[in-house]
Interface confidence: low
């Protein structure tokens, strides 16, 4: 037979008694605690700092505060200084700054994250220009420039004309990683360093000698030729040098083709057909053009008085 333990129980302050096997349980009204509801519940007055959990000690009714991270003390009202707990919570030599209930890290250049645990990739922002290669380093970046560029960000196009490389008043054109010289007439080469040999193309004809000069050349003609390039054969038949004949032009010479009865370089000499004494038997010879005439003595006749 079950004995009603509540009959002899002493639940305080109007608490409700519940009988159990060989025991009882006092159900306390609001604000009371303890086995017999005989103690005031200390948590009623909210003694624990906001954000803490309050539990009542069932023996003495006092409040037990369970503190959230960053707080300590009986009422969880004291801030924990995380920066003074030994090891620096901020990595990579970040500076620890205590805050209420927590801490902050001031990171060195090149690091980020709540605890400075992340190495910033300085190349993410593409700081290197003109197709340069970006090398991420701790707290910095380095640009490896393409040829023809310089500067921290490879932003400067190297002025290859700065050293005035073009000679002989050549005009320098700055290009990417190179320069180009526009040479004045008569000069050539990457730097306009060469005087153009105008004789290289053998402009002088007919065996003439070529004399190279600055931006010009002179042809010294061989005998019988004339013109800038000695390309003109001089006409030695003009004016006609042949007196009694026709002229044939040659190289630096001429030939007279004499009419019959004439001879000499210029056909200037009339051939004396009487010089061979063609008239016989005392006939008299008279010279004619390419002919002769015999005047015969009485008693002789024939072209040469031979009869």
């Amino acid at each position: 037979e079950n004995i009603d333990d509540c009959a002899s129980a002493a639940c305080f302050h109007g608490a409700t008694c519940h009988d159990r096997v060989a025991s009882f349980y006092c159900e306390c009204p609001h604000g009371r605690t303890g086995l017999l509801c005989h103690l005031n519940d200390a948590c009623i007055s909210n003694p624990c700092n906001e954000g803490s959990n309050c539990d009542t000690n069932p023996v003495n009714g006092k409040a037990i505060c369970t503190c959230p991270s960053g707080y300590t003390g009986p009422a969880c009202s004291q801030d924990v200084d995380e920066c003074s707990l030994g090891a620096n919570p901020c990595e990579h030599a970040g500076k620890c700054i205590n805050t209420l209930g927590s801490f902050e890290c001031q990171c060195l250049q090149g690091y980020t994250g709540p605890r400075c645990e992340i190495d910033v990739n300085e190349c993410v922002s593409n700081p290197c220009q003109n197709d340069a290669t970006c090398l991420d380093q701790i707290g910095e970046f380095q640009c490896i420039c393409m040829p023809g560029y310089e500067g921290v960000h490879c932003e400067v196009n190297t002025d290859e004309c700065a050293s005035s490389p073009c000679l002989h008043n050549g005009r320098c054109l700055d290009k990417i990683n190179e320069f180009q010289c526009e040479c004045p007439t008569g000069f050539t080469g990457h730097l306009c360093q060469y005087d153009v040999d105008e004789c290289a193309s053998t402009p002088c004809k007919n065996g003439a000698k070529c004399l190279d000069g600055p931006n010009t050349y002179t042809c010294v003609c061989t005998e019988g030729y004339t013109g800038t390039h000695c390309e003109v054969d001089i006409d030695e038949c003009d004016p006609d040098p042949c007196h009694y004949g026709s002229c044939k032009d040659g190289v630096a010479t001429f030939t007279c083709l004499c009419r019959p009865g004439y001879t000499g370089h210029h056909c200037e000499t009339n051939i004396n057909e009487c010089s061979s004494q063609p008239c016989r038997h005392g006939g008299t010879c008279q010279d004619r053009d390419n002919a002769y005439l015999c005047f015969c003595l009485k008693g002789t006749t024939g072209p040469n008085c031979e009869i």
Epitope: Q109, Q137, G139, E140, Q142, E150, V152, T158, S163, P165
Partner: antibody, heavy 115, light 109 residues
Framework: EVQLLESGGGLVQPGGSLRLSCAAS????????MSWVRQAPGKGLEWVSS????????YYADSVKGRFTISRDNSKNTLYLQMNSLRAEDTAVYYC????????WGQGTLVTVSS | QSALTQPASVSGSPGQSITISCTGT?????????VSWYQQHPGKAPKLMIY???NRPSGVSNRFSGSKSGNTASLTISGLQAEDEADYYC?????????FGGGTKLTVL
């Protein structure tokens, strides 16, 4: 005008230490890597060490590795070379130089290692 | 960090032209446009004469010119003058260091 001025040279015994400084002016110091170059009496030029603009990367010749330390203080526009365990063969004029296509050199400071 | 190869000495008469060669590898001269030439008179700091293979700093005579072909760089001095007598050093770069030539002594006869 771009200028580099070395200081800190002098006479030191073998095994001793010396710290060279190089004060820079006339350009944005942190934008440029810097080098130390030395020249022994009657000999040629020898590269010693280099450091990147912010000091993250350092490079050393085999002959000084483990004994010399290059560093820089960009707030003071100054380059340093800490030389430890000095030997007679470290005797030289030490020049600091700016790393760029058109390099700039200082006038040098003489380091003599002798007992 | 091997040194670049230069002739130990060259000489020429006033008015003549001379060329100093500087031979490296594909890791230095052959791999970079970064070639400089320095002139050094006794007791003086090196003076930059040519940078970026063929560029002259302002104030350097146009008698000095530089060029590069493959792994070899060259410095040419035309119209030699007495004051050109000095030591000349070539300089290039590899991936992490500077590389110098052993130096060439120029004598003006």
């Amino acid at each position: 005008e771009v200028q580099l001025l070395e200081s800190g040279g002098g006479l030191v015994q073998p095994g001793g230490s010396l710290r060279l400084s190089c004060a820079a002016s006339g350009f944005t110091f942190s934008n440029y890597g810097m080098s130390w170059v030395r020249q022994a009496p009657g000999k040629g030029l020898e590269w010693v060490s280099s450091i990147s603009g912010y000091g993250s990367n350092t490079y050393y010749a085999d002959s000084v590795k483990g004994r010399f330390t290059i560093s820089r203080d960009n707030s003071k526009n100054t380059l340093y070379l800490q030389m430890n365990s000095l030997r007679a063969e470290d005797t030289a004029v030490y020049y600091c130089a700016r790393i760029s296509q058109q390099a700039v050199w200082g006038q040098g400071t003489l380091v003599t290692v002798s007992s | 960090q091997s040194a670049l190869t230069q002739p130990a000495s060259v000489s020429g008469s006033p008015g003549q032209s001379i060329t100093i060669s500087c031979t490296g590898t594909s890791s230095d001269i052959g791999g970079y446009q970064y070639v400089s030439w320095y002139q050094q008179h006794p007791g003086k700091a090196p003076k930059l004469m040519i940078y970026y293979v063929s560029n002259r700093p302002s104030g350097v005579s146009n008698r000095f010119s530089g060029s590069k072909s493959g792994n070899t760089a060259s410095l040419t001095i035309s119209g030699l003058q007495a004051e050109d007598e000095a030591d000349y050093y070539c300089q290039s770069a590899d991936s992490s260091s500077w590389v110098f030539g052993g130096g060439t002594k120029l004598t003006v006869l």
